[in-house]
Amino acid sequence: EGAAQPNNSLMLQTSKENHALASSSLCMDEKQITQNYSKVLAEVNTSWPVKMATNAVLCCPPIALRNLIIITWEIILRGQPSCTKAYKKETNETKETNCTDERITWVSRPDQNSDLQIRTVAITHDGYYRCIMVTPDGNFHRGYHLQVLVTPEVTLFQNRNRTAVCKAVAGKPAAHISWIPEGDCATKQEYWSNGTVTVKSTCHWEVHNVSTVTCHVSHLTGNKSLYIELLPVPGAKKSAKLYIPYIILTIIILTIVGFIWLLKVNGCRKYKLNKTESTPVVEEDEMQPYASYTEKNNPLYDTTNKVKASEALQSEVDTDLHTL
């Protein structure tokens, strides 16, 4: 009798040791109990975000177990009947009604610890959890609106010239996307049946001194930033103004070449007549290097090869960003 002096875990409400398996405890409430006993009897509710796949511990009010009569946990999950887990101290019995989720349990024996634990939190655990403690001084409540958080998968890629796409896939709640520097952006949200949301932001930068852009994804589970270099995509549509220098340059070069050719034709006619039949071949040889150059580099030429190059660039950019 009284031989062992307890750490008040037996005498108080919970045992810290039992929280070793929990990666997030929903017991740490910034709000203090209200100031007098009559107000303490009023219900205290807390909205609590918790990451998916972690373990969570929910606490009752700070009532000494020695002074308890009944502890009841009421669990209301979306689309399910209300589940109750109760413990009666006088008879030392526990009772459950409509409780099917085996991951929601007492942390330990309820006569030692009134906490409730959720092992490996899933999206389906979104809901309202309430501890009701019946004591000689009345009923004390502590309720939690549990919001399960899902970290979105973030990707960033360039899909057109000076246009980038940032995606936050399957987050809960929806992530917020911002850009540095700001561009001309359009954001779309896609809602999934499991409660997650995909956010897609597409931005275009007209200003040419912008070479690197950063996509910043804000979420309750943490923030993430990815950056990308805006590479000029070969074969992509360009405005008419951008083509003018190329056109003028081409005309000038063609004019000069044509003029030289005419000079050659007129000034060397007698000389050419004395040559063999192979002259046109020589002429073609002289022109070949230039012809091949213009074909490979002039955007006015057929762009079939350029489209293939653009596709190659696209996959290259994707791969690089996934490794960030």
């Epitope: 037996l10 108080l12 409400q13 700070p62 020695r66 000689p136």
Partner: antibody, heavy 119, light 112 residues
């Protein structure tokens, strides 16, 4: 209103015994844990013992363990402290106090009874 | 055992002026349920102790709002915003996290 009235104090010789009583009123005695706390003359407060509402658990300060016994009679709304092998250092005012439901302290105290251990 | 240390041990205060008492514990009083198991009691001359503050910062019923408690873990403070004559006495902090319950040595507040 809640009232706690201690009795049984007095002058006693070292090594002798004494039994203190605390009669409770104004609340459902059988629903609350009860404590004894003492205060030596001119000194601070020292917790002595606790008993649960149903008497199922009792805990003691090291200084009195094995010598003092806390008990209760819920039918009489009375708390007891049986003090054996008394020592001079047990001289103090002894208060009974009601265990507070919220947290882990004392919400109501008796007026105290003085125990003097002297030869 | 958890050791409670109060300072100052004596505090002369002019009526209407504020007063502040510090209490330090040898280990954290923050329970895993998020509450600090620290109480403040006042023992007026010739009387039994009375509860002022529970769970670190919650005023007990009937306690004037000039009394406030703050702190977490191992460091706690009791503040009296404007001292009144009836506030004189010895103030004790007490931890209820572990048995045995332990008190500070007490701070005697008196009129200057």
């Amino acid at each position: 209103q809640v009232q706690l009235v201690e009795s049984g104090g007095g002058v006693v010789q070292p090594g002798r015994s004494l039994r203190l009583s605390c009669v409770a009123s104004g609340f459902t005695f059988s629903s609350y844990g009860m404590h004894w706390v003492r205060q030596a003359p001119g000194k601070g407060l020292e917790w002595v013992a606790i008993i649960w509402n149903d008497g199922s658990n009792r805990y003691y300060a090291d200084s009195v363990k094995g010598r003092f016994t806390i008990s209760r009679d819920n039918s009489k709304n009375t708390l007891y402290l049986q003090m054996n092998s008394l020592r001079a250092e047990d001289t103090a005012v002894y208060y009974c106090a009601r265990d507070r439901i919220v947290g882990a302290g004392f919400d109501y105290w008796g007026q105290g009874t003085l125990v003097t251990v002297s030869s | 055992d958890i050791v409670m240390t109060q300072s100052p041990l004596s505090l002369p205060v002019t009526p209407g002026e504020p007063a502040s008492i510090s209490c330090r514990s040898s280990q954290s009083l923050l329970h895993s349920n998020g509450y600090n198991y620290l109480d403040w009691y006042l023992q007026k001359p010739g009387q039994s102790p009375q509860l002022l503050i529970y769970l670190g910062s919650n005023r007990a019923s009937g306690v004037p709002d000039r009394f406030s408690g703050s702190g977490s873990g191992t460091d706690f403070t009791l503040k009296i915003s404007r001292l009144e004559a009836e506030d004189v006495g010895v103030y004790y902090c007490m931890q209820g996290l572990q048995t045995p319950w332990t008190f500070g040595q007490g701070t005697k507040v008196e009129i200057k």
